[in-house]
């Protein structure tokens, strides 16, 4: 899995959407979780609804809430009032029984102030062996979000 | 094991810059945030702000804003704070701290300390 | 800022005494995420800080289990069961819930 940068700024909120294959994922919940440590279990933040049919429902933990388009393929999370605590590596993910498929991995950036936008370059980090030109980096910026496809080293 | 090397003391003349530096060992550098904090004489500790290796991103604390200025060198895994117009309220020892949380803020806590540099300010 | 206010700020002990050091925040440190971001540093010496206890009662990994730490509302207390050697030193308590980070004046304990 690639992993995808979404940047937002303190105060205000960031939204991550995580598509994946509607049918391939027909009546599965999701959840978003943290990985907390190099290596270590990811820890579940939020998980949407039991019944898998309201999962359109935005359900919250604190300031954490996921809402779920099953039909369209997309997985929301929304992260409000965004704290330097929220930054971290996280995984949205798709749930079979005691199971759980990584849909997307999220790298979670908050920045002090808008001005501390970098540009896409900086976006970019290596993995053990990849050089610049291997970095495939898409990048849209708006007030509080930027987000871009980034390389990343494993995380085993 | 983890190590944060911090660079040596630095005696300066009002008005002057410093760059101190701490460099990293043993763990990937760009995977944790990196704090620094002031220690004056016989005081308490202060913060500064932290930044996160990876991306070059800085949250600063509004006090030390126009005097800190936070860097890293991933080549090198170390980081850099340069502190400017240097007075003698700038005489302290300082700290790197490494946060303790995989790609999180070092607002977690911070789970390993470096060295520590200590600045004197004199004429 | 968050105002973290240490007590006392001089601790004389024997070894093999319990100790116990306070520290309170002049507002709540309950993050909106749910944890409370109090963390316990003890600086021997010369040396640098090291973490003892974070997120109020979690022990950093080696700190024996004679530390403990518990919380009150704004209140919060590091104790040492029974103090060695090699407790002795300048205890912070640290807030990091709030911006910006902050640290308490810090407990000397030292030998009677």
């Known amino acids: 899995h690639n992993t995808t940068v979404f940047q937002g700024v303190a105060g205000q909120s960031l939204q991550v959407s995580c598509p994946y294959d509607s049918m391939k994922h027909w009546g599965r919940r999701k959840a978003w979780c943290r990985q907390l440590g190099e290596k270590g279990p990811c820890q579940r933040v939020v998980s949407t609804h039991n019944l898998w049919l309201l999962s359109f429902l935005r359900r919250w933990n604190g300031s954490t809430a996921i809402t779920d388009d099953t039909l369209g393929g997309t997985l929301t999370i929304t992260l409000r009032n965004l704290q330097p605590h929220d930054a971290g590596l996280y995984q949205c993910q798709s749930l079979h029984g005691s199971e759980a498929d990584t849909l997307r991995k999220v790298l979670v950036e908050v920045l002090a102030d808008p001005l501390d936008h970098r540009d896409a370059g900086d976006l970019w980090f290596p993995g053990e062996s990849e050089s610049f030109e291997d970095a495939h980096v898409e990048h849209s910026i708006s007030r509080s979000l930027l987000e871009g496809e980034i390389p990343f080293p494993p995380t085993s | 094991q983890v190590q944060l090397q911090q660079s040596g003391a630095e005696l300066a003349r009002p008005g002057a810059s410093v760059k101190l530096s701490c460099k990293a060992s043993?763990?990937?550098?760009?995977?944790?945030?990196l704090s620094w904090v002031k220690q004056r004489t016989g005081q308490g500790l202060e913060w500064i702000g932290e930044?996160?290796?990876?991306?070059?991103?800085?949250y600063s604390n509004e006090k030390f804003k126009g005097k800190a200025t936070l860097t890293a060198d991933k080549s090198s895994s170390t980081a850099y704070m340069e502190l400017r117009s240097l007075t003698s309220e700038d005489s302290a020892v300082y700290f790197c701290?490494?946060?303790?949380?995989?790609?999180?803020?070092?607002?977690?806590?911070?789970?390993?300390w470096g060295t520590g540099t200590t600045v004197t300010v004199s004429s | 800022d968050v105002v973290m206010t240490q007590t006392p700020l001089s601790l004389p002990v024997s070894l093999g005494d319990q100790a116990s050091i306070s520290c309170s925040s002049s507002?709540?440190?309950?993050?909106?995420?749910?944890?409370?971001?109090l963390h316990w540093y003890l600086q021997k010496p010369g040396q640098s800080p090291k973490l003892l206890i974070y997120?109020?009662?979690n022990r950093f990994s080696g700190v024996p289990d004679r530390f403990s730490g518990t919380e009150s509302g704004t209140d919060f207390t590091l104790k040492i069961s029974r103090v060695e050697a090699e407790d002795l030193g300048v205890y912070f308590c640290?807030?990091?819930?709030?911006?910006?980070?902050?640290f308490g004046a810090g407990t000397k304990l030292e030998l009677k």
């Open positions: 701290a490494k946060g303790g949380v995989y790609y999180g803020s070092s607002y977690w806590y911070f789970d390993v």
């Open positions: 043993g763990y990937t550098f760009t995977s944790y945030a």
């Open positions: 930044i996160y290796p990876r991306s070059g991103n800085t």
């Open positions: 507002q709540s440190l309950v993050h909106s995420n749910g944890n409370t971001y």
């Open positions: 997120k109020v009662s």
């Open positions: 640290s807030q990091s819930t709030h911006v910006p980070l902050t």
